[in-house]
Interface confidence: medium
């Protein structure tokens, strides 16, 4: 990702000013209605054949301040008998998310937008067996 | 949802002003470096026992403008023989993400933060069998 210092879309805005003067309205709008924020975490993390745990990643100078990061419980998947299946691997599904980070000691409050790669849950895939040539 | 500043940090900042006047510095964006955005999608979506497809959700007035949303290919999971297993369900793992939407015709650029619930991938869970009382 790159930001190039030159601005044309707002003709009277100099790039150096622009980069410092982008405003964000932080009343967070739910594009899917109020249910998004209040939805209960699912129990998939325990019931999955590739179960995972959630770890709290907390940063008071970030929005959202708490991000739950998934980690697969096992390297392998759990079969119908509850045993680990050595032909199947638990793998982490990751997603890139946007977060806002508060610039240290900034008044008025200044945030920078950052990207984070977070684990969301795990899925079960067949092991890739590499055969010697 | 809203981000409310700690009143001690900027004592003269009213919350109502703050919410409309937060500045975002776009100079520092990727906490994981430029490769994050260009990383190739994994092949888990095809190899998983709960495979999924990715559908393009595109909105030029949003950042990120292109978001790939997962949908499970089958209601059931795929077993080792490549057949659907009617005791196991494919379920969608969802995550709430932040996106930026540009306020219409705003110069200097003003954005609002929105939440979106997106499907990231699928996992396989045992069907819950409900027994009659």
């Amino acid at each position: 990702a790159a930001i190039i210092p030159q601005s044309s879309a707002c003709p009277n805005t100099e790039a150096k000013d622009f980069l410092q003067n982008v405003k964000v309205n932080l009343k967070v709008f739910n594009s899917l209605g109020a249910k998004v924020s209040s939805r209960r975490p699912s129990d998939y993390l325990n019931r999955s054949t590739s179960p995972w745990t959630l770890h709290r990643n907390e940063d008071p100078d970030r929005y959202p301040s708490v991000i739950w990061e998934a980690q697969c419980r096992h390297q392998r998947c759990v079969n119908a008998e509850g045993k680990l299946d050595h032909h199947m691997n638990s793998v982490l599904i990751q997603q890139e998310i946007l977060v806002l980070k508060r610039e240290p000691e900034s008044c008025p409050f200044t945030f920078r937008v950052e990207k984070m790669l977070v684990g969301v849950g795990c899925t079960c895939v067949a092991s890739i067996v590499r055969q010697a040539a | 949802a809203a981000i409310i500043p700690q009143s001690s940090a900027c004592p003269n900042t009213e919350a109502k002003d703050f919410l409309q006047n937060v500045k975002v510095n776009l100079k520092v964006f990727n906490s994981l470096g430029a490769k994050v955005s260009s990383r190739r999608p994994s092949d888990y979506l095809n190899r998983s026992t709960s495979p999924w497809t990715l559908h393009r959700n595109e909105d030029p007035d949003r950042y990120p403008s292109v978001i790939w949303e997962a949908q499970c290919r089958h209601q059931r999971c795929v077993n080792a023989e490549g057949k659907l297993d009617h005791h196991m369900n494919s379920v969608l793992i969802q995550q709430e993400i932040l996106v930026l939407k540009r306020e219409p015709e705003s110069c200097p650029f003003t954005f609002r933060v929105e939440k979106m619930l997106v499907g990231v991938g699928c996992t396989c869970v045992a069907s819950i069998v409900r027994q009659a009382a």
Epitope: A1 | F29, S37, P60, Y63, S65, F111
Partner: nanobody
Framework: EVQLVESGGGLVQPGGSLRLSCATS????????MYWVRQAPGKGLEWVAE????????YYVDSVKGRFTISRDNAKNSLYLQMNSLRAEDTAVYYC????????????WGQGTLVTVSS
């Protein structure tokens, strides 16, 4: 997957011309402003030119005004840069980039095409 692939670079003498092309896929090309940016050896990225969605507005960095022309063909999902009166200081890797609502912030750009201006 969003893809941008540049072509048309090469070695040219000062005063010569080149036409760069950028083929795109994976997004609705006609909905986005598009950019050419460049990186000279040992230098940072420099914005060169921008074209709006319908091609009605074009912007150029001062150093290329009157010499470079940005254009697009929405039917072919392609972006172009016609470079005339090339100078040694135009030597760089040229990238096409997909615009975002965050102005001049690029998530997606191609692998680049090298333009060398030398006698």
């Amino acid at each position: 997957e969003v893809q941008l692939v540049e072509s048309g670079g090469g070695l040219v003498q000062p005063g010569g011309s080149l036409r760069l092309s950028c083929a795109t896929s994976g997004f609705t090309f006609s909905s986005y402003g598009m950019y050419w940016v460049r990186q000279a050896p040992g230098k940072g990225l420099e914005w060169v030119a921008e074209i709006k969605q319908d091609g009605s507005e074009k912007y150029y960095v001062d150093s290329v005004k009157g010499r470079f022309t940005i254009s697009r063909d929405n039917a072919k999902n392609s972006l172009y840069l016609q470079m005339n009166s090339l100078r040694a200081e135009d030597t760089a890797v040229y990238y096409c980039a997909k615009g975002e609502i965050l102005p001049l912030y690029f998530d997606y750009w191609g692998q680049g095409t090298l333009v060398t201006v030398s006698s």
